[in-house]
């Protein structure tokens, strides 16, 4: 199948709703975490104030075979205006510290909750 069309949808999701859905998914991940998330995989830490959505995706996309974060990876791909592939790092991404996926998710969740409270849906 080579001809691909858009998935049917009732219409664009408002940014506030999209952000809330991402927060809910991250909450779900943190609450349902039993064993170490993604077998304790390490990812690059990111600057949460600089081009955060693409940077978060660039970091998490390098984790493969972890079903717990697949939905998050899909959601973040919609939050980033350019296509992100594994091993790709934009100039916004400072690669100096690696942290566990579980900590990455917690840090991202805290920051997104703060943005949501402040009404920063852009």
């Amino acid at each position: 199948l080579t001809c691909l069309g858009g998935f049917a949808s009732p219409g664009p999701v408002p940014p506030s709703t999209a952000l809330r859905e991402l927060i809910e998914e991250l909450v779900n991940i943190t609450q349902n975490q039993k064993a170490p998330l993604c077998n304790g995989s390490m990812v690059w830490s990111i600057n949460l104030t600089a081009g955060m959505y693409c940077a978060a995706l660039e970091s998490l996309i390098n984790v493969s075979g972890c079903s717990a974060i697949e939905k998050t990876q899909r959601m973040l791909s919609g939050f980033c205006p350019h296509k992100v592939s594994a091993g790709q790092f934009s100039s916004l991404h400072v690669r100096d510290t690696k942290i566990e996926v579980a900590q990455f998710v917690k840090d991202l969740l805290l920051h997104l909750k703060k943005l949501f409270r402040e009404g920063q849906f852009n």
């Epitope: 691909l4 069309g5 858009g6 998935f7 664009p12 999701v13 940014p15 999209a18 952000l19 104030t49 600089a50 081009g51 955060m52 959505y53 693409c54 791909s77 919609g78 939050f79 205006p81 350019h82 296509k83 592939s85 790709q88 934009s90 100039s91 916004l92 009404g119 920063q120 849906f121 852009n122």
Partner: antibody, heavy 118, light 109 residues
């Protein structure tokens, strides 16, 4: 050399549907998101939506979401934009554009003029 | 839906400096809006000047620079040339869609 070549100008009646193609060369279409932009005569630019040609996943602007359909044929490296229920205010130039981090919207098609007139 | 506003028109003297701004109705513009700036001349397709807030496209002259200024995206043209006379548009990303600015007509006079 990266090129985006769009189909030719169209003159259509209100209520009709237009399909514009954007044939790319110099890169693989599945490696990038393809965006579409509208520009009415003497007016500004308006983002219509984008498609990930790899899996067909789309994002549409609220204004266009119920009338626009973006598709891609990966076998021919061609993106398509279909706009239905045309009205006179849809008279515009439509551009396809390649977006990637290292030069967002860096490459544009030449534009396709669509004239809607009864 | 957000509205992205630019100055309708600005005039700059040859060799002079002018700053164009891009304001979001939803609040301060941030790096997560991935601001883009375009130049468009009559009868031509737009041409990308700045992407990701402050990155120049390979063909963009050094006299153009992008930044965040007072909660807005800004494009500064230092040392204006006659060929810089054009319409300039910004575009901001809002989590899942772009919105283009209203456009600024820059006259070099």
């Amino acid at each position: 050399e990266v090129q985006l070549v769009q189909s030719g100008a169209e003159v259509l009646k209100p209520g009709a549907t237009v399909l514009i193609s954007c044939k790319v060369s110099g890169f693989t279409i599945t490696d990038y998101y393809m965006h579409w932009v509208q520009q009415a005569p003497g007016k500004g630019l308006e983002w219509m939506g984008r498609i990930d040609p790899e899996d067909g996943e789309t994002k549409y602007a609220p204004k266009f979401h119920d009338r626009v359909t973006l598709t891609a044929d990966t076998s021919t490296d061609t993106a398509y934009m279909e706009l239905s229920s045309l009205r006179s205010e849809d008279t515009a130039v439509y551009y396809c554009t390649r977006y990637d981090y290292y030069g967002p919207f860096a490459y544009w098609g030449q534009g396709t003029l669509v004239t809607v007139s009864s | 839906q957000a509205v992205v506003t630019q100055e309708p028109s600005l005039t700059v003297s040859p060799g002079g400096t002018v700053t164009l701004t891009c304001r979001s109705s939803t609040g301060a513009v941030t790096t997560s809006n991935y601001a883009n700036w375009f130049q468009q001349k009559p009868g031509q397709a737009p041409r990308t000047l700045i992407y990701g807030t402050n990155n120049r496209a390979p063909w963009t002259p050094a006299r153009f620079s992008g930044s965040l200024l007072g909660g807005k995206a800004a494009l500064t043209l230092s040392g204006a040339q006659p060929e810089d006379e054009a319409e300039y548009y910004c575009a901001l990303w809002y989590i899942n869609h772009f919105i283009f600015g209203t456009g600024t007509k820059v006259t070099v006079l």
